[in-house]
């Protein structure tokens, strides 16, 4: 709330003040009165207004002038009209009264002053005056809510610059300028007023590395945009002539909320009066805004594509070739990572998420850049960032890292209602163990943390430890349906799979093999339906996957009639460490490419019958009535042997969603 | 959209070696697969081959390996075709064309019609 | 090579009637259920242009009255109703396998 200094009545000799237009600035009366005095009255010119906070006045002169008593819960407030065009130019005269004294009287000289710094509190993309009386200090969340935003400078209008926008401390140009906040400090003073008074923006010091502050000054680009406040400047002193006069600053974001920082950043302006050089500058007035820096947020496969990733990589010229056709129809572009930029990773989907960053008046798409540094890392940096696509990574020592800190671990799910809570952005998805032991793996804390503190979608941690890999991604996905709903969850069903095998074989097709076409052991249903140690290991997958179900049904306010069970086998291998981790026993269905009604579904190999893989015709009589289209993708040889499938090969990005972040309630 | 942009003609002599070029007109040029086809009169369409992009990715007709070779130059957005050893049955119109999906061909130049003669 | 022979080589057809064409493979153009085949439009001193891909696909911006369909070797193109400006050659291609090769084309000429 901006807030006047306040001012102390000195009887027998004049005061002088400032007051700020739209501020009420206190008045002690009481303090300064002199003894034996027990009322007062008080008149002021034409241009202030005097408010008095009291009962009703002991007594009404036949002047009409009140007066009032000199009581411990007295407050008298004084407001200006206008700025004043000279010094002292409005007057307030406070006459105590005393039973047995004569009058005494108290000028005070004031000077009105026009001062208000404004952002675009009202988040409709435009900055406009700050309304008097309104708190711009404080932020609030929800459709009703007020408060400036900013966003992190995070994308690279120069293709040949280093790093990102943030990291230098130049304005390149407008479209550099169109990622920042706007905010106007606005001042209309006596022509002198300047020589006495001082005004000063700042920023709170343990904030400084959050922000940086340009301010545009007369001139020619770039060099008309000075830093003010940064990292190596945590305040500015501002040299203004007197009268009306604007300066215009512009705010960048240099950190994303994370763990030890909530996001919010006041910028604050402060009036000194510098007039006696013997005396420590006096604080006359202060104004705040705050900021808060605009989260990360996660695309759900609910919202429509707009660009798919892959990598070329040896043989994979057929997955391609499936995968451009399903891109074209889904009217997405196609981006492809070469082989000499990929060394042998294909694995995009855990090199990177992209979402977006959103203010009212500019939307930025934001690849995160996961930790994990294999043959794909220098991709998020070198061909997604650029002009209007931002970047954001958390660097981690490798030491650290588990495959669980892969973004194959990491999705969103669409929008729910969890008892009444709304989640209009959806939650957050990630795997962990299940419970803590020496060998189990979680996705690393710092992960955690900084998608927590985005605060918008507040993250469901899953248990994903038992895959050998340990992808949320290898047992789960959405799929939009056009129904009120709008989506549905599919989990990977051992139980599923073994429901259709067994009554196949009891429609006597029990000699219908898996892996037809592959050079690889053929396996009858009969085969697989009589292996004990199979069903075992798919009896402990399924309980997993169950505990996930309960999970996912609670925090996501989930119904059964929500979820669609996706036939799957699993079979246990020991990893490094020699545990029995669970991996796909054909190609993991589940883990399939959304595009709008579009599915790339990995191929699955399974028994023909009829002319048609059995597999996929269950996946198909549950998604073709939700008005999706199934594409089955033969990812066998390039990615499922190396376990991997569709999703865990491609990446995308999407339309941000409609909703604005700021109108939901965290 | 993109455009490409082809030069109209180019007359060489026999035995001779042409480079064929092929601008395109958006800065996206990287993300495009550049194919080209050859089209003699009365005699229908011939795949020559493509190039991926970022220069990745090259895939010939066979018949055409020893005969052309695919370059992009990426600060110019410029896909080139150079064809050596010309013969009286070079001459054709060759085209070029560029693909957002791999193999589906989108959008293509007005081609350029190769004279080779004496 | 995948040889691609299309019929018939000419046909002439009147304003607001059906024109059909068809494109046979000397062996199968499918991949993982998708007929790797598309249509092109030529007109004299014009470069082709897509009107149909994956056998069935209406390319964006193209007519709805274009339409194809087919898998394994045999694949049809229907104009209907045939307009004026659709007085053009036209060609099958196939991308299922190098070396990707068009067919002879099918002439159409509006009576």
């Known amino acids: 709330m901006a807030q006047g200094a306040v001012i102390h009545v000195a009887p027998e000799q004049p005061t002088h003040a400032v007051c700020v237009v739209g501020t009420a600035t206190p008045l002690d009366v009481r303090g300064s009165a002199p003894k034996g005095y027990t009322t007062f009255g008080i008149t002021a010119s034409p241009g202030v207004i005097v408010d008095v906070i009291h009962g009703p006045p002991v007594k009404k002169s036949t002047m009409g002038a009140s007066k009032w008593p000199l009581d411990p819960e007295l407050e008298v407030t004084l407001q200006v009209k206008a700025a004043s065009s000279r010094t002292d130019d409005e007057k307030v005269r406070v006459s105590y009264y005393g039973p047995k004294t004569s009058p005494v009287q108290a000028l005070i000289y004031i000077t009105g002053v026009e001062l208000s710094l404004s952002a675009d509190v009202t988040r409709t993309g435009r900055v406009k005056p700050a309304q008097a009386g309104k708190d711009q200090s404080t932020w609030t969340w929800g459709p009703g809510g007020r408060g400036a935003i900013l966003l992190v400078n995070c994308d690279k209008e120069d293709p040949q610059a280093s790093g990102m926008d943030f990291e230098d401390d130049k304005i390149l140009d407008n479209k550099d300028l169109q990622d920042m906040s706007p905010m106007t400090l606005s001042t209309k003073t006596p022509k002198d007023f300047f020589e006495k008074y001082q005004l000063v923006l700042e920023v709170p010091k343990a904030k400084m590395n959050r922000v940086r502050v340009f301010r545009a000054t007369r001139g020619k680009l770039p060099s008309r945009y000075k830093v003010a406040l940064g990292p190596q400047q945590f305040s500015y002193c501002l040299e203004l002539p007197g009268g009306q006069h604007s300066t215009d600053f512009y705010v960048e974001g240099l950190a994303f909320p994370d763990a030890d920082f909530k996001g919010l950043i006041p910028l604050t302006i402060s009036l000194l009066d510098k007039s006696n050089p013997e005396l420590p500058e006096a604080l006359v007035f202060q104004d705040s805004v705050t900021f808060r820096v605009a989260p990360w947020i996660m695309t759900p496969n609910t919202q429509p594509p707009q660009e798919v990733y892959v990598c070329r990589v040896s043989d994979n010229e057929d997955f391609l070739k499936s995968l451009a056709t399903l891109t074209k129809k889904a009217k997405c572009k196609l981006t492809v990572c070469p082989e000499e930029e990929n060394i042998d990773d294909q694995w995009m989907q855990d090199e990177m998420e992209i979402g977006y960053i959103q203010a009212p008046h500019k939307t930025l798409p934001v690849v995160f850049d996961s930790p994990r540094d294999r043959g794909l890392k220098d991709f998020p940096v070198k061909r997604v960032m650029g002009p209007n696509f931002g970047y954001v990574t958390r660097k981690l020592y490798m030491s650290e890292l588990t495959g669980l800190d892969a973004f194959g671990n990491l999705e969103v799910s669409p929008p729910v209602t969890v008892r009444g809570k709304e989640y209009p952005l959806g939650r957050i998805l990630i795997g962990n163990s299940g419970y803590s032991s020496s060998e189990s793996r979680d996705m690393h804390q710092a992960l955690q943390d900084f998608l927590s503190a985005q605060q918008v979608q507040a993250p469901v941690r899953l248990f994903s430890d038992w895959l050998f890999v340990g992808h949320v991604d290898e047992f789960l996905s959405f799929v939009p349906a056009r129904d009120k709903q709008g989506f549905r969850l599919l989990l990977s069903s051992p139980r599923a799979c073994y429901q259709l095998f067994q009554e196949l074989q009891s429609q006597g097709h029990g000699e219908a093999t898996l892996f037809e076409g592959l050079k690889r052991k053929r396996q009858t249903i009969n085969e697989i339906l009589s292996n004990k140690k199979l069903r075992d290991q798919n009896a402990y997958v399924e309980s997993c996957i169950d505990w996930n179900r309960a999970v996912l049904k609670r925090e996501l306010g989930l119904a059964e009639g929500d979820i669609i069970d996706i036939p799957q086998l699993f079979k246990l291998a020991g990893n490094s460490r020699g545990n029995s981790k669970a991996q796909a026993f054909f190609p993991n269905m589940v883990n399939m490419l959304v595009l709008g009604k579009y599915l790339g579904i990995p191929k699955p190999f399974g028994p023909i019958i009829d002319g048609h893989c059995c597999l996929e015709e269950e996946v198909r009589s549950h998604l073709e009535p939700l008005g999706l289209h199934c594409t089955f993708i033969n990812d066998f040889y390039t990615y499922h042997v190396y376990n991997g499938e569709v999703h865990c090969g491609t990446n995308v990005r999407r339309k941000p969603f409609t909703f604005k972040w700021w109108h939901m309630v965290p | 959209e993109v455009q490409l942009q082809q030069p109209g003609a180019e007359l060489v002599k026999p035995g001779a070696s042409v480079k064929l070029s092929c601008k395109a007109s958006?800065?996206?040029?990287?993300?495009?697969?550049i194919h080209w086809v050859k089209q003699r009169p009365g005699r229908g369409l011939e795949w020559i081959g493509r190039i991926g992009p970022n220069s990745g990715g090259s895939k010939y007709n066979e018949k055409f390996r020893t005969k052309a070779t695919l370059t992009v130059d990426k600060p110019s957005s410029t896909a080139y075709m150079q064809l050596s050893s010309l013969k009286s049955e070079d001459s054709a119109v060759y085209f070029c064309a560029f693909s957002n999906y791999l193999d589906y061909l989108d959008y293509w130049g007005q081609g350029t019609t190769l004279t080779v003669s004496s | 090579d995948i040889v691609l022979t299309q019929s018939p080589a000419s046909l002439a057809v009147s304003l607001g009637q059906r024109a059909t064409i068809s494109c046979k493979a000397s062996?199968?153009?499918?991949?993982?259920?998708?007929?790797?085949m598309n249509w092109y439009q030529q007109k004299p001193g014009q470069p082709p242009k897509l009107l149909i891909y994956?056998?069935?696909n209406l390319e964006s911006g193209i007519p709805a009255r274009f339409s194809g369909s087919g898998s394994g070797t045999d694949f049809t193109l229907n104009i209907h109703p045939v307009e004026e400006e659709d007085a053009a050659t036209y060609y099958c291609q196939q991308i299922n396998e190098d070396p990707y090769t068009f067919g002879g084309g099918t002439k159409l000429e509006i009576k």
């Open positions: 062996q199968s153009v499918d991949h993982d259920g998708e007929g790797y």
């Open positions: 958006d800065h996206t040029f990287t993300t495009y697969w």
């Open positions: 994956a056998a069935s």
